[in-house]
């Protein structure tokens, strides 16, 4: 048993039929010694008396809020949550496996630049009685500070008959140098509590590996005289690290016809302009990627050819 | 200002070209190592991230763009040693920090070159003959060092009498290639920045 936060405790249980469970000793937080009784939840049934209560925790019915009283007055509470281990593996019932980039990916994170700011998100099909708290650090043995905000519901999607809920959190490394070469990964830890069930999820990454620039901005077309060609120009996204001559991007320019089946013409360039042939009803799209470290491409920025 | 299209300083340009070749070569070599050593811990998640140049050079700090010198988090340990006369520098542009930066890059390359050559000698003794260092990568390191053209005493290649542990050597190769790729990215950024300045 360990303390998650004040008056909230997590009991780790091996979960199998007829498992013996864990013996837990609860202590009433009071200077009083006599006349103390214990109840579970809002029941009036007395479980025991005395300053300590010893219970055998086997299942969810044994979890909940234990309260010690004296003479009708509440002295203190202890909320017990359960963390299930089945076949040696901690349960992952609360979050959905996103399966990207690999199986057992519950948390996904992205950064728009090298400032040390990043966003993580996760999915669940549970919509009520759910709380998350997020901690993060650089390295684990001698951790350096990363500050995370509160997790918030960022999207709801319908997937067949089910609704899926996306939660996200923003974190910022306390003292980040954009030019630094990372040798210790960022660790992100999410505590998830659904009713009386506790689970924890972790992710470990280097900022350089989760970079995904915003799409290029100010995408413009300039027709060239007496030609079907156009000059496409764009700018670095505002959120990208500066100076741009140090944090350089490379770009992919694509001409795509109305039909998805039509052949796509693609050009790769380090410049912020390119000359392409604009077909009728086609659109021109540009996306960006770090020029020197191949992490994710940005989403496309697009303009119609007409 | 986005990627200036001004004509690059011819003195600087060879280094930019060589640094791009270097990054391409080390990336290819790392990919080859990951594929060939698929049953070894060779991915970024599996290896320990060691930097053989730690406490010996300070490339990141010495080569910090001016715009980032206001960021206190970037100013942990700026070196102040002074080495001059790199052929990548046109003399009129020579500056204290730039010379220090390029000499730090040169020292990095020299250290990695020695490590890679020593390692290759061990890998050539492996009866499995599973993996060797790409000669192109070693050549590209050499070319960039020549373009930087700093006078520095040569470091003798480490030789070892004992029978090498080939498993350990291959793990070390992965660690080295990951670290060198990260340093090659920094070198490329620096060259691009200097070329645009």
């Amino acid at each position: 048993i360990w303390e998650l936060k004040k008056d909230v405790y997590v009991v780790e249980l091996d979960w199998y039929p007829d498992a013996p469970g864990e013996m837990v000793v609860l202590t009433c937080d009071t200077p009083e010694e006599d006349g103390i009784t214990w109840t579970l939840d809002q029941s009036s049934e007395v479980l025991g008396s005395g300053k300590t209560l010893t219970i055998q925790v086997k299942e969810f019915g044994d979890a909940g809020q234990y309260t010690c009283h004296k003479g009708g007055e509440v002295l203190s509470h202890s909320l017990l949550l359960l963390h299930k281990k089945e076949d040696g593996i901690w349960s992952t019932d609360i979050l959905k496996d996103q399966k990207e980039p690999k199986n057992k990916t519950f948390l996904r994170c992205e950064a728009k630049n090298y400032s040390g700011r990043f966003t993580c998100w996760w999915l669940t099909t549970i919509s009520t009685d759910l709380t998350f708290s997020v901690k993060s650090s650089r390295g684990s043995s001698d951790p350096q500070g990363v500050t995370c905000g509160a997790a918030t519901l960022s999207a709801e999607r319908v997937r067949g008959d089910n609704k899926e809920y996306e939660y996200s959190v923003e974190c910022q490394e306390d003292s980040a140098c954009p030019a630094a070469e990372e040798s210790l990964p960022i660790e992100v830890m999410v505590d998830a509590v659904h009713k009386l069930k506790y689970e924890n999820y972790t992710s470990s990454f280097f900022i350089r590996d989760i970079i995904k620039p915003d799409p290029p901005k100010n995408l413009q077309l300039k027709p060239l005289k007496n030609s079907r060609q156009v000059e496409v120009s764009w700018e670095y996204p505002d959120t990208w690290s500066t100076p741009h001559s140090y944090f350089s991007l490379t770009f992919c320019v694509q001409v795509q016809g109305k039909s998805k089946r039509e052949k796509k013409d693609r050009v790769f360039t380090d410049k912020t302009s390119a000359t392409v042939i604009c077909r009728k009803n086609a659109s021109i799209s540009v996306r960006a990627q770090d020029r020197y470290y191949s992490s994710s491409w940005s989403e496309w920025a697009s303009v119609p050819c007409s | 200002r986005n990627l200036p299209v001004a004509t690059p300083d011819p003195g600087m340009f060879p280094c930019l070209h060589h640094s791009q070749n270097l990054l391409r070569a080390v990336s290819n070599m790392l990919q080859k190592a990951r594929q060939t050593l698929e049953f070894y811990p060779c991915t970024s998640e599996e290896i320990d991230h060691e930097d053989i140049t730690k406490d010996k050079t300070s490339t990141v700090e010495a080569c910090l763009p001016l715009e980032l010198t206001k960021n206190e988090s970037c100013l942990n340990s700026r070196e102040t040693s002074f080495i001059t006369n790199g052929s990548c520098l046109a003399s009129r542009k020579t500056s204290f920090m730039m010379a220090l930066c390029l000499s730090s890059i040169y020292e990095d390359l020299k250290m990695y070159q020695v490590e890679f050559k020593t390692m290759n000698a061990k890998l050539l003794m492996d009866p499995k003959r599973q993996i060797f260092l790409d000669q192109n990568m070693l050549a590209v390191i050499d070319e960039l060092m020549q373009a930087l053209n700093f006078n520095s005493e040569t470091v003798p290649q480490k030789s070892s009498l004992e029978e090498p542990d080939f498993y350990k050597t291959k793990i070390k190769l992965c660690i080295l290639l990951h670290a060198f790729r990260i340093r090659a990215v920094t070198i490329d950024r620096v060259m691009s920045y200097l070329n645009a300045s």
């Epitope: 579970l40 939840d41 809002q42 299942e59 969810f60 019915g61 909940g64 809020q65 909320l79 019932d93 099909t125 549970i126 919509s127 009520t128 009685d129 008959d161 089910n162 609704k163 009713k195 009386l196 069930k197 | -």
Partner: antibody, heavy 120, light 107 residues
Amino acid sequence: EVTLRESGPALVKPTQTLTLTCTFSGFSLSTSGMGVSWIRQPPGKALEWLAHIWWDGDNYYNPSLKSRLTISKDTSKNQVVLTMTNMDPVDTATYYCARRTRVNYAMDYWGQGTTVTVSS
Amino acid sequence: SVVMTQSPDSLAVSLGERATINCKASQSVSNDVAWFQQKPGQPPKLLIYYASNRYTGVPDRFSGSGYGTDFTLTISSLQAEDVAVYYCQQDYNSPWTFGGGTKVEIK
């Protein structure tokens, strides 16, 4: 002893707004982990959950009725109020309030219910 | 929303015999299922929570089991006072939903 009691009009006209009050004793909505739900049961039919409010003001609604429902609490009066707009004869039912706590997450105490008929 | 399908709709059992009511969820609801008993003219009464935990004061002839999508309420030895309608309810996901009910009578 925990008790809950529902009150409100027995008859409402179609399109009118229904306001129901749940008055409770034996627990307080200022206590962490306490909540109150509203449930209804049309004559001879199954139960349907409508809305829930927690001690901290956080609330949940049945999505199919969300646009018509508002749940609120008055902690000092030990009351929870449910309003339902644009009433229709199909809303004729017995309306119950029930306590639901953060500890066993079950509706453990129910009121006796109040019958509401929607008719012109 | 999660549909809770109860079976059978009604059940006639001799006094002292076992009564079994099933409840099937349209998707996994973990163990977030409660069972209620409702007698005519009365509000529902909580019997079981977290699929298998008997609520305070509920006789031990009532037991619940199941996880995921399939749940069962068992009355091991039916008594005259057990004649009622029984409902399962999930609160894994909003909206919290009830089954259609199973009427238990004495044969």
